[in-house]
Interface confidence: medium
């Protein structure tokens, strides 16, 4: 018979016949002969390899390295590389996750509206009119002004998107 | 020169309570948001629990919720970590910390809490 020119799914073309691919999870050792099956052998412990395959070699799982900034999120299998994600209070600086940097702060005059999580960064918003921040935060909202009024006080000093009010005592009119 | 000094930490049986105080210097105390790391034997820093600057927002890491309290006295340039039912794997050195925008820049030297019976 003609030697095949191609072979089904799964399957791979060596020495003019069809032999199988590893499934993942496996590595080759030797390709089939006209006697003998694909050879193929489990990755070891940190290893993977994620697709029907004729690679002789398995992949080594990422690492997660701590002076980065980075922890595992999923553990690696035969069959899948090992994840990454940021430790609290950092972010990944790329979708691979190769590593993370510190959530950025919101600076005065600007309060937190999103909180920042493993992906994505601190998203800060204008403190708008009746609100302040006077402080540089990853955490912190903006706040309401002081209330004069509920403390029996009048404003002495307007507040801004930076400052709360300053209250003072109501003159006294003399009798 | 900033300089960060942890104490409070000790001895202490699983169930107990610690309260951790961190005495700041240098910089400008009630305009820093400050953290609290701890590095348990033969492990890599784990983040805690951090506070803003006016002390008004906390966060916890999900493995203290519920049983430690991060509070801070601005007129004292002073950070705390109230330590309730404490357990063994709390066991760590413990690190308050300051920031800048791209690093924790300020390390205290740790206070170490051994949570054992």
């Known amino acids: 018979p003609e030697p095949p020119t191609a072979c089904r799914e799964k399957q791979y073309l060596i020495n003019s016949q069809c032999c199988s691919l590893c499934q993942p999870g496996q590595k080759l050792v030797s390709d089939c002969t006209e006697f003998t099956e694909t050879e193929c052998l489990p990755c070891g412990e940190s290893e993977f390899l994620d697709t029907w395959n004729r690679e002789t070699h398995c992949h080594q799982h990422k690492y997660c390295d701590p002076n980065l900034g980075l922890r595992v999120q999923q553990k690696g299998t035969s069959e899948t590389d090992t994840i990454c994600t940021c430790e609290e209070g950092w972010h990944c600086t790329s979708e691979a996750c190769e590593s993370c940097v510190l959530h950025r702060s919101c600076s005065p005059g600007f309060g937190v509206k999103q909180i920042a999580t493993g992906v994505s960064d601190t998203i800060c918003e204008p403190c708008p009119v009746g609100f302040f921040s006077n402080v540089s935060s990853a955490f912190e909202k903006c706040h309401p002004w002081t209330s004069c009024e509920t403390k029996d006080l009048v404003v002495q000093q307007a507040g801004t998107n930076k400052t709360d009010v300053v209250c003072g005592p109501q003159d006294r009119l003399r009798a | 020169e900033v300089q960060l000094l942890e104490s409070g930490g000790g001895l202490v049986q699983p169930g107990g309570s610690l309260r951790l105080s961190c005495a700041a210097s240098?910089?400008?105390?009630?305009?820093?948001?400050m953290t609290w790391v701890r590095q348990a034997p033969g492990k890599g820093l784990e983040w805690v629990s951090s506070?803003?600057?006016?002390?008004?927002?906390?966060y916890y890491a999900d493995s203290v919720k519920g049983r430690f309290t991060i509070s801070r006295d601005n007129s004292k340039n002073t950070l705390y970590l109230q330590m309730n039912s404490l357990r063994a794997e709390d066991t760590a050195v413990y690190y308050c910390?300051?920031?800048?925008?791209?690093?924790?820049?300020?390390w205290g030297q740790g206070t170490l809490v051994t949570v054992s019976s």
């Open positions: 910390a300051k920031r800048t925008r791209s690093k924790f820049d300020y």
């Open positions: 240098g910089f400008t105390f009630s305009h820093e948001d």
């Open positions: 506070i803003s600057p006016n002390g008004w927002d906390t």
